[in-house]
């Protein structure tokens, strides 16, 4: 796969994943539960990071936001933070990767700069994806630990306050947002890895400039074993003759047929 294709595909995959992370963060269906065991109406409860909703069999739906931060579980706050960090890093990653794309020319930006930006965006996407995956997994773990509520508590108070609180033993299931979050986090992570791989292809290979081969022409030969010049006394008569087979060649021959000693 070419560097441009790898980089472009990594960008698109990360973009899809990033969109999924935003969608998952905004969705209400992080946890779902059917509460059929009451005599008034069948109730379907679903909860997100920002509000809790109740849908009745009549179709009526009521959602209430988590307006207080103090009463919320620390784990929920942590999940919110992780998802927001993932989104913020994703936004930065997208902005950086747009400028890093090989198919987009911006000023006199060389491949070295684009390679660094590609690597940066790749790392940002990887961290963004990891944040989303951890956030969703923490929430899922929170649901698993709350699968069965079996204790009954007695709250007593003055003036008719209080009463018996019974926990209802029903199972909460993973909502659609969890699966969206896992897939989106995975895609963002994969896209980030692809960007990092593309970065390697964009980086100029320094070794190309370290090994230089020098080719000397036949006219600049400094040493010719076994040969002798006109100064030996043979004069022009011997100019185009071979002295012996396998011996030194004349100057005319040497210009068109360099020997193995012509390289210094």
């Amino acid at each position: 796969m070419s560097v441009t294709a790898c980089q472009g595909l990594g960008f698109v995959v990360s973009l899809i994943g990033f969109a999924g992370i935003i969608a998952a963060t905004c969705m209400d269906q992080w946890s779902t539960q059917d509460l059929y065991n009451n005599p008034v109406t069948a109730v379907f409860n679903y909860q997100g990071l920002w509000r809790s909703c109740v849908r009745e069999s009549s179709g009526f739906t009521e959602c209430r936001g988590y307006f207080t931060l103090l009463g919320l579980p620390a784990m929920l706050q942590a999940v919110r933070a992780l998802m927001i960090v993932g989104i913020v890093l994703g936004v930065i990653g997208i902005l950086v990767s747009i400028f890093a794309l090989k198919c987009i020319r911006i000023g006199s930006m060389d491949d070295s700069a684009k390679a660094k930006m590609t690597l940066t965006s790749g790392i940002l996407f990887i961290i963004s994806g990891i944040c989303a995956i951890i956030g969703v997994s923490v929430f899922a773990n929170m649901l698993v630990t709350n699968f069965w509520m079996s204790t009954a508590n007695m709250y007593s108070g003055m003036g008719g306050m209080g009463g018996m609180v019974q926990t209802v033993q029903t199972r909460y299931t993973f909502g659609a947002a969890l699966f969206v979050g896992w897939v989106a986090g995975g895609l963002t992570l994969i896209g980030g890895v692809m960007m990092c791989i593309a970065c390697r292809g964009l980086t100029p290979d320094d070794s190309n400039f370290k090994a230089v081969s020098y080719h000397a022409s036949g006219q600049n030969v400094a040493y010719r074993p076994g040969g002798f010049k006109a100064s030996t006394g043979f004069g022009s008569n011997t100019r185009n003759k071979k002295i012996y087979d396998g011996g030194a060649r004349t100057e005319d021959d040497e210009q068109s047929h360099p020997t193995k000693y012509d390289y210094v």
Epitope: L35, R51, E56, T61, R64, G71, N146, V165, V168
Partner: nanobody, 120 residues
């Protein structure tokens, strides 16, 4: 914690009226269903009336046409208007709410009960 405060019980003559109220307070997300149950001496607890957030209601057979349930969602309060009371309506009336109490958890909360006595 979720607390329920019931009020409105008392002594009333047959054919009279009473209005019970029950307010939920504490930390919770939603209260999908609020309702009233009653338990007469020596009898099992039975549904009087229930109401959902959307206004869906359900009444016990013995009170249909005489009792009316309503709720104020903003105040998390349920009301039971009891008209044409009969001696057989004498019982301890319990407020009952289904509370979405947190992420992945919900509670069925019962009040301590308020006594309604219908007598000459």
């Amino acid at each position: 914690q979720v607390q329920l405060q019931e009020s409105g019980g008392g002594l009333v003559q047959p054919g009279g009226s009473l209005r019970l109220s029950c307010a939920a307070s504490g930390t919770f997300f939603n209260i999908p269903v609020m309702g009233w149950y009653r338990q007469a001496p020596g009898k099992q607890r039975e549904l009087v009336a229930g109401i959902s957030t959307g206004g869906t209601t359900n009444y016990g057979d013995s009170v249909k046409g005489r009792f009316t349930i309503s709720r104020d969602n903003a105040k998390n309060t349920v009301y039971l208007q009891m008209n044409s009371l009969k001696p057989e309506d004498t019982a301890v009336y319990y407020c009952n709410v289904l509370v979405i109490s947190g992420i992945g958890s919900h509670l069925e909360v019962w009040g301590q009960g308020t006594l309604v006595t219908v007598s000459e």
